[in-house]
């Protein structure tokens, strides 16, 4: 059994996340998960999830309770999701941590935003004509 | 040249993003893109700078000004980073509007770490000794 | 004050087995990741094995698989390295090295701390 | 493969600047953070560079490290040469499946 495991059954008796009432109105993720077979389309989405969970982790890490079994799988998280490697979570925390409502962080992001948007399609790298089929549009004539 | 750079730049005069003092202290997403160049880890990144950019976008949604040229980047994110395919765009949404602070959904969230956890890692599909091998780690007996 | 003292070293004969160990102290134990790594006489060093903090999920050099073993003793601050079917080219100096806590985003550098290293010899 | 190749040795006079690189073989550099190690004879290696550019406290600011993307390569540069500069210095980063990895050392002697 992966460590998480044990880890994850903590946390849920800590949130009594294990009562019947909890499945109610469908699930935040799973059935998201189930949509997105394309391992890029699953990295779009997971993305998303794990900052959730860094996130949720963060507003509990004071508490004792549940210290070790957050850090547990926090680490298994970086295992799994990050390949243990720590340049790759640095830059995933750097962009979670950015501030929207920073007037500087707000300028440098309009600032980038045309060459963010360059290399936003899968084929960005491989020129203009290439990448029109990849995302199926073609600009109509101006 | 593509749609949304002549709005871009109308965000730029906007929130002063031409002046030279923007590109002190480095980037925001640029370096960080540049350090990834498999799909899966560029999706990982993107993911968050995309809903960075639709956070920020969502602050301006009411000024008149700026309206245009934010709608037409945004129907360009649609097409190039979630290939105009709305019910991506909608999870991803989805996604990116859980509350942390909701008990409700932090319940849910620690009732679907097991499946979630058990998916993170890129082979999570094609069973556990499959799985050890794509991030190339055992777990030692207890 | 950061620690890791190896033991276990020796003489041993090609085709034996040997377990080499790792005591540390100064850290809290279980939050990192432990390395082993060795130094043949003369040679520069190589990667051997990783064993995880919390999760105990063990990586090893594709050379090594199958041969060596690592495991750890959180409750003891320990970390082993099992070798069996030992060789010549296994004649090395082998290193406990200090890792990441890959749970902590602002964790100290990786192979930050070494320890002195023990000396295995395989001779016949 | 994965292989981090070094230069085998260096000289250069005191006082002078040397730069040892470190070509990684697959992969790209900027996708795994690199640390330089400093192995004085009979010594344990210890980290002078971690995670590209960082210094850990101690080592001196003539001591640094870099990355270039456009030759696929970290550098480590030490200026104003001492004579206790003279040891083997080691490249480290980690290969796709974040396996750890080392060049092949390369020999600074100080003339």
């Known amino acids: 059994q992966d460590p998480y495991v044990k880890e994850a059954e903590n946390l849920k008796k800590y949130f009594n996340a294990g009562d019947p009432d909890v499945a109610d109105n469908g699930t935040l993720f799973l059935d998201i998960l189930r949509n997105w077979k394309e391992e890029s389309d699953r990295k779009i989405m997971q993305s998303q999830i794990v900052s959730f969970y860094f996130k949720l982790f963060k507003n509990f890490k004071d508490d004792q309770r549940i210290q070790k079994s957050v850090e547990t799988i926090k680490e298994d998280i970086n295992v799994k999701f990050f390949n243990s490697n720590k340049k790759k979570r640095d830059d995933f925390e750097k962009l979670t941590n950015y501030s929207v409502t920073d007037s500087n962080v707000q300028r440098k992001a309009v600032h980038e935003l045309i060459q963010v948007m360059a290399e936003l399609s899968p084929a960005a790298k491989i020129g203009k004509r290439k990448r029109s089929q990849m995302f199926r549009g073609r600009r109509a004539s101006q | 040249q593509d749609p949304y750079v002549k709005e871009a730049e109308n965000l730029k005069k906007y929130f002063n993003a031409g002046d030279p003092d923007v590109a002190d202290n480095g980037t925001l997403f640029l370096d960080i893109l540049r350090n990834w160049k498999e799909e899966s880890d560029r999706k990982i990144m993107q993911s968050q700078i995309v809903s960075f950019y639709f956070k920020l976008f969502k602050n301006f949604k009411d000024d008149q000004r700026i309206q245009k040229s934010v709608e037409t980047i945004k129907e360009d994110i649609n097409v190039k980073f979630f290939n105009s395919n709305k019910k991506k765009r909608d999870d991803f949404e989805k996604l990116t509007n859980y509350s942390v602070t909701d008990s409700n959904v932090q319940r849910k969230a620690v009732h679907e770490l097991i499946q979630v956890m058990a998916e993170l890692s890129p082979a999570a599909k094609i069973g556990k000794r499959k799985r050890s091998q794509m991030f190339r780690g055992r777990r030692a007996s207890q | 004050e950061v620690q890791l003292v190896e033991s276990g070293g020796g003489l041993v004969k090609p085709g034996d087995s040997l377990t080499v160990s790792c005591v540390a102290s100064?850290?809290?134990?279980?939050?990192?990741?432990i390395h082993w790594v060795r130094q043949a006489p003369g040679k520069g060093l190589e990667w051997v094995a990783t064993?995880?903090?919390?999760?105990?999920?063990?990586f090893y050099s594709d050379s090594l698989r199958g041969r060596f073993t690592v495991s750890r003793d959180n409750a003891n601050n320990s970390v082993y390295l099992h070798m069996s079917s030992l060789r010549g080219e296994d004649t090395a100096l082998y290193y406990c090295?200090?890792?990441?806590?890959?749970?902590?985003?602002?964790?100290?550098?990786?192979?930050?701390?070494w320890g002195r290293g023990t000396l295995v010899t395989v001779s016949s | 493969n994965f292989m981090l190749t070094q230069p085998h040795s260096v000289s250069e006079s005191p006082g002078k600047t040397i730069t040892i690189s470190c070509t990684r073989g697959?992969?790209?550099?900027?996708?795994?953070?690199v640390q330089w190690y400093q192995q004085r004879p009979g010594g344990v290696p210890k980290i002078v560079v971690f995670?590209?550019?960082?210094?850990p406290s101690g080592v001196p600011d003539r001591i640094s490290g870099s990355i270039d993307t456009s030759t696929n390569s970290a550098s480590l540069t030490i200026s104003g040469l001492q004579t206790e500069d003279e040891a083997d210095y080691y490249c480290?980063?980690?290969?796709?499946?974040?396996?750890?990895?080392f060049g092949g050392g390369t020999k600074l002697t100080v003339l």
């Open positions: 090295v200090r890792g990441y806590d890959h749970s902590d985003s602002n964790s100290a550098a990786d192979l930050l701390h």
């Open positions: 100064g850290f809290t134990f279980s939050n990192y990741f």
């Open positions: 064993i995880s903090g919390r999760t105990k999920y063990m």
């Open positions: 697959r992969g790209y550099i900027a996708s795994y953070y």
């Open positions: 995670e590209d550019t960082q210094r």
């Open positions: 480290q980063s980690y290969d796709d499946a974040n396996h750890v990895i």
